[in-house]
Interface confidence: medium
């Protein structure tokens, strides 16, 4: 038994043009969640299968609101580790899926909005009890930086957390300070004690008395950030014991190659030799296969049988994107004619037609006057998707059924008196005024 731990360092726009400013729109505040799913690495299960090794969810991130015009700050991330406990042996090779989700806060039509911003997947080799492994993954325009490790929970030990070491009350053949291990009585294991003072956050050891540093830290006890380290030798060796990193313009400084790639200097820059399953300038692209289940929304994964061959997602109707992760906005094609309102219901496309039009795409122009009679000698006028009656004098209303009082609206200005007449209305103007409506 043990725990897989994932630490998210940063999530934000990746390098290059076209990268978004921030995951939040300027309109609404939002917060992020991270979700991790683990599966035994050699399993052929698709992403839709349960996370056989376990899954975890980060705490809710702090609420973030983008300030228009202000420089984009580092996005506030959820606190703490994502921890996935495992009960059985650690498989050594595992597949992971890490999803970054955004929750938009505030009132909006259709309810709160959730978005899957990024989804990265990969397969890794990892021994339990080893140091933190660092990784950078890109998904579309986003970049996710994280570290992970697997550690055994006592009394389990070993690279797969399968050996049990329990101190026994009976005398043992193990020397002083050594623990007897079950099930092999004659196997003795020393408790791993790092060098005294070795930083618990930035250092680790694989041998007793050792202090090895995580990337970005140096010094005998791994307490010095590399940017502030000072070396006596101008180009001394990179070493956790001397606390020196090679300074200066060396393009391989700090090893820009991710995922265990090895860096070699070239006359102009550097070159990464990537391990199997990774590619890209810095070995940052993981060889995701169909076994990692990269296709969303019922997409069919083809090819990608091994990490060195690409996969293709064949998307079902209504979805697009390299992983079928985007819903096609079918309304953007403006399928509704004659000013109809388009409704994409997911399972179907509907058009809400304006009055006077019908059909699945509002393609039929109805005869607005069909079956519509205008009373009292009125005539029907078709147009604008609705029928209208042009009424004879003295009548009004939608169907000319109402007797019209032409004086009801008090049309005579400046105190003029209104008289209804068969041909319309007549204004008798007050002294000093003239005109059809006494307007002058």
């Amino acid at each position: 038994a043990g725990v897989f731990e994932l630490q998210i360092h940063s999530f934000g726009p990746g390098p290059g043009p076209g990268a978004p400013r921030s995951p939040c729109s300027a309109r609404l505040p939002c917060r992020l969640f991270f979700r991790v799913c683990l599966k035994p690495g050699l399993s052929e299960e698709a992403a839709e299968s349960p996370c056989a090794l376990g899954a975890a969810l980060s705490a809710r991130g702090p609420v973030y609101t983008e300030q228009p015009g202000a420089p984009a700050p580092d996005l506030p991330l959820p606190d703490g580790l994502l921890q996935v406990p495992f009960r059985d042996a650690w498989p050594g090779t595992f597949s992971f899926i890490i999803e970054t989700w955004r929750e938009e806060l505030g009132d909006q039509i259709g309810g709160p909005a959730w978005s899957l911003l990024a989804r990265v997947a990969g397969r890794r080799r990892l021994a339990a009890g080893g140091p933190w492994a660092r990784d950078i993954q890109r998904a579309g325009a986003w970049e996710l930086r994280f570290s992970y490790r697997a550690r055994c929970e006592p009394p389990a030990v070993g690279t797969a957390c399968t050996r049990l070491c329990r101190p026994r009350s009976a005398p043992s053949r193990c020397g002083p300070g050594l623990r007897p291990c079950a099930p092999l009585e004659d196997e003795c294991e020393a408790p791993l004690v790092c060098r005294a003072g070795c930083s618990p956050e930035h250092g680790f050891c694989e041998q007793p008395g050792e202090c090895r540093c995580l990337e970005g830290w140096t010094g005998p006890l791994c307490t010095v950030p590399v940017s502030t380290s000072s070396c006596l030798s101008p180009r001394g060796p990179s070493s956790a014991t001397t606390g020196c990193l090679v300074p200066g313009p060396g393009p391989c400084d700090g090893n820009p190659c991710a995922n265990g790639g090895s860096c070699s200097e070239t006359p102009r820059s550097f070159e990464c030799t990537c391990p199997r399953g990774f590619y890209g300038l810095r070995c940052e692209v993981s060889g995701v296969t169909c076994a990692d289940g990269p296709c969303f929304n019922g997409g069919l994964c083809v090819g990608g049988a091994d990490p060195d061959s690409a996969y293709i997602c064949h998307c079902p109707p209504g979805f697009q994107g390299s992983n079928c992760e985007k819903r096609v906005d079918r309304c953007s094609l403006q399928p509704c004619r004659n000013g109809g309102l388009c409704l994409d219901l997911g399972h179907a496309l509907r058009c809400r037609c304006r009055a006077g039009f019908a059909g699945p795409r509002c393609e039929h122009d109805l005869d607005d006057c069909a079956g519509r009679a205008c009373a009292n000698g009125g005539t029907c006028v078709e147009g604008g998707g609705a029928h209208r009656c042009s009424c004879a004098l003295g009548f009004g209303g939608r169907d000319c059924r109402e007797r019209a009082d032409p004086c009801a609206a008090r049309p005579c200005a400046h105190g003029g008196r209104c008289y209804a007449h068969f041909s319309g209305l007549v204004c008798a103007c007050a002294p000093g005024y003239m005109g059809a409506r006494c307007e002058f």
């Epitope: 839709e48 309810g111 994409d344």
Partner: nanobody
Framework: QVRLVESGGGSVQAGGSLRLSCAAS????????MGWFRQAPGKEREGVAT????????AYADSVKGRFTISQDRAKNTVYLQMNSLKPEDTAMYYC???????????????????WGQGTQVTVSS
Amino acid sequence: QVRLVESGGGSVQAGGSLRLSCAASGSTYSTNFMGWFRQAPGKEREGVATLVTWVERTAYADSVKGRFTISQDRAKNTVYLQMNSLKPEDTAMYYCAAAAASTDVRLLDPGDFAYWGQGTQVTVSS
């Protein structure tokens, strides 16, 4: 694919209660959102309540807040809608729907849900 089967509908007097169930089968890992929607005769389908299945976050239409509760049993891949203090205007066909991971999911917008059940009728008489 995801298959959804609703049950629990029926007729009830105003002020009464009903509990709807929706059992999901198939590729349920990707059903990150499960919700209940309803459609009364001659009206548009509208969101009632939705659950973000992996964070236990919920959203309710204003008309049902305080009366309806959405919940889930993860082990059974089932989502429930407990409806209390029912009113005649709650009469409608109730549909269970699921949405997979997507670019954008508005929790009460039927257009953002890809998978739908056949529906179960709820009738509230005064």
